[in-house]
Amino acid sequence: MAVTACQGLGFVVSLIGIAGIIAATCMDQWSTQDLYNNPVTAVFNYQGLWRSCVRESSGFTECRGYFTLLGLPAMLQAVRALMIVGIVLGAIGLLVSIFALKCIRIGSMEDSAKANMTLTSGIMFIVSGLCAIAGVSVFANMLVTNFWMSTANMYTGMGGMVQTVQTRYTFGAALFVGWVAGGLTLIGGVMMCIACRGLAPEETNYKAVSYHASGHSVAYKPGGFKASTGFGSNTKNKKIYDGGARTEDEVQSYPSKHDYV
């Protein structure tokens, strides 16, 4: 029961996490900065992985997509790649984990197969979460680096003066969504891996058994202690014990009245 709960919870947590990673990837608010402020209106810019928008306090919004790949920072491309890899791995993980769920019966799928699938999906969720966390962290680092590098300066441009305006960059909502979603996916993956251990069929347990001789000169039957395979009559690893003394020749003979199972 605990295994099913752990697996189910891991699946749900990962599902929420991956939905969050998708949401963060699509969001425009990865970074925000104030562009202009006066008593009448304020203009701020928010930028995502795919487009940049300018919004005014009046509600007017204008967005433009990044149609060229050449002019974009390499770091942005890296973040895009990390987020997409995270989404793809997460989606595959979800698909695999649906079939691995203990509460869902598909044909005559053995527990060992379900355990393997659970482990596979768990690892996929962990990698997916790490990709998202890495992507968001790389972006956050890029923002901080750009902010400190963009010191206010003035120079002569084409047909007049150009002045860099020192604006305050702030982390957008998408960064926090991405961090939380990545963390949830990671936690979900760990839960799936934990559930996998409980799903795996138990290996043969060779328990130590103490033998007590009934007489002074006792010979034990070779192979008298059988390991259980989970099938057949001896399912509880019971001792096959011979209390009487036998000669070497008698060992292979049919069971006597002294033998009991």
Epitope: V43, N45, S52, S57, F60, G71, P73, N146, S150, V162
Partner: nanobody, 121 residues
């Protein structure tokens, strides 16, 4: 980079009108705000009027009611209609654009070379 082309300056009698125009060209991601500033001889550059892409306008106290700013977003153009001009409106008028050129970089203020407006009494 952004290039600003100004036109419409000249000499005008007090009480007269003039219309200044400015067109922004070049490669940029966004234009946040366009506007006009002026600089009289021996004085600091001061705000005349600004307009955002959404049409929100802001005027200096000295130009309110007399000057009117308008823009054409499709052409990235801004115009300043100046009425009831006075001798103390004499100055070099500069077109200004605050634009974003690069992704994840701060905006730049671009200035035109200026157009002379002289109001004679």
């Amino acid at each position: 980079q952004v290039k600003l082309e100004e036109s419409g300056g000249g000499l005008v009698q007090a009480g007269g009108s003039l219309r200044l125009s400015c067109v922004a060209s070049g490669s940029f991601l966004h234009i946040a705000v366009m506007g006009w500033y002026r600089q009289a001889p021996g004085k600091q550059r001061e705000l005349v009027a600004t307009i955002t892409r959404g049409g929100a306008t802001h005027y200096a106290d000295s130009t309110k009611g007399r000057f009117s700013i308008s823009s054409d977003n499709a052409k990235n153009a801004v115009a300043l209609q100046m009425n009831s001009l006075q001798p103390d409106d004499t100055a070099v008028y500069f077109c200004n654009v605050r634009a974003l050129i690069k992704v994840f970089h701060p905006p730049n203020d671009y200035w035109g070379q200026g157009t002379q407006v002289t109001v004679s009494s």
